[in-house]
């Protein structure tokens, strides 16, 4: 079937990075500068995307693939193919309909995007809170109270770095 198709349509032999040039007896011609074809058998090459203004080039255009853009620092891509740029927030915040807002008490976000997530509930695993949570960090769960009873052998973990104003419960 493939061979039959190629006999009928010489363009099917043109690989990615070329186009079937009707002006030259359907010879496979390389894509001109600033254009590409990502599949074979194409009759035209597509114009490369230009990452301008708020968009920066993440990946250069090649003869077989389009350029890829990302956003200027402090912002991240949104939409198909990075059609928009949305602001990053600080750690301890989330992006809402009213802009970047601090995480509510009992929640945290350790990244510059995404939503605030609830602190881990240590007691669900039968553990205790070793280090309190903050807006930027989850709580650190320690051994269960039973593990800390006299005579119980336990390996003492290294003291975690604590943020000012937060002491373990």
């Amino acid at each position: 079937f493939e061979r039959t198709r190629s006999l009928q349509d010489p363009c099917s032999n043109c690989p990615a990075g070329t186009f079937c040039d009707n002006n030259r007896n359907q010879i496979c011609s390389p894509c001109p500068p600033n254009s590409f074809s990502s599949a074979g058998g194409q009759r035209t090459c597509d114009i490369c995307r230009q990452c301008k203004g708020v968009f920066r080039t993440r990946k250069e255009c090649s003869s077989t693939s389009n350029a890829e853009c990302d956003c200027t620092p402090g912002f991240h891509c949104l939409g198909a193919g990075c059609s928009m740029c949305e602001q990053d927030c600080k750690q301890g915040q989330e992006l809402t309909k009213k802009g970047c807002k601090d995480c509510c008490f009992g929640t945290f976000n350790d990244q510059k995007r995404g939503i605030c997530r609830p602190w881990t509930n240590c007691s669900l695993d039968g553990k205790s809170v070793l280090v309190n949570g903050t807006k930027e960090r989850d709580v650190v769960c320690g051994p269960s109270p039973a593990d800390l009873s006299p005579g119980a052998s336990s390996v003492t973990p290294p003291a975690p770095a604590r943020e000012p104003g937060h002491s373990p419960q």
Epitope: G74, F75, D88, C89, K90
Partner: nanobody
């Protein structure tokens, strides 16, 4: 309802300086992206500079090194310091604010202030 009011525009000689202000009322905009746009006669409105809530800034290529955007969240105000002005900077300058986007249509717009740079 959020209102944005620009001030500081005017007529200035090429090479001179102006400082535009954009005062917001009706809501604290500390978490918003704020931007300065301009529209020259017969041309499309373009984004000149923007600043995120965290202080990240963006400048259009033609104003880099000459314009500086800043914000004072305590005063709910944004500024655009324009130095080494050129005749091609002549336009109506608008301030805008959006909770999320650097690109696209901003939620809130000011009425604009005219900047004219004479040669």
């Amino acid at each position: 309802q959020v209102q944005l009011q620009e001030s500081g525009g005017g007529l200035v000689q090429a090479g001179g300086s102006l400082r535009l202000s954009c005062a917001a009322s009706g809501r604290t905009l500390s978490g918003y992206v704020m931007g300065w746009f301009r529209q020259a006669s017969g041309k499309e409105r373009e984004l000149v500079a923007a600043i995120s809530s965290g202080g990240s800034t963006y400048y259009e290529d033609s104003v880099k090194g000459r314009f500086t955007i800043s914000r004072d969240n305590a005063k709910n105000t944004m500024y655009l310091q324009m130095n080494s002005l050129k005749p091609e900077d002549t336009a109506v300058y608008y301030c805008a604010a959006d909770p999320r986007r650097l690109t696209g249509l901003y939620d809130y717009w000011g009425q604009g202030t005219q900047v004219t740079v004479s040669s």
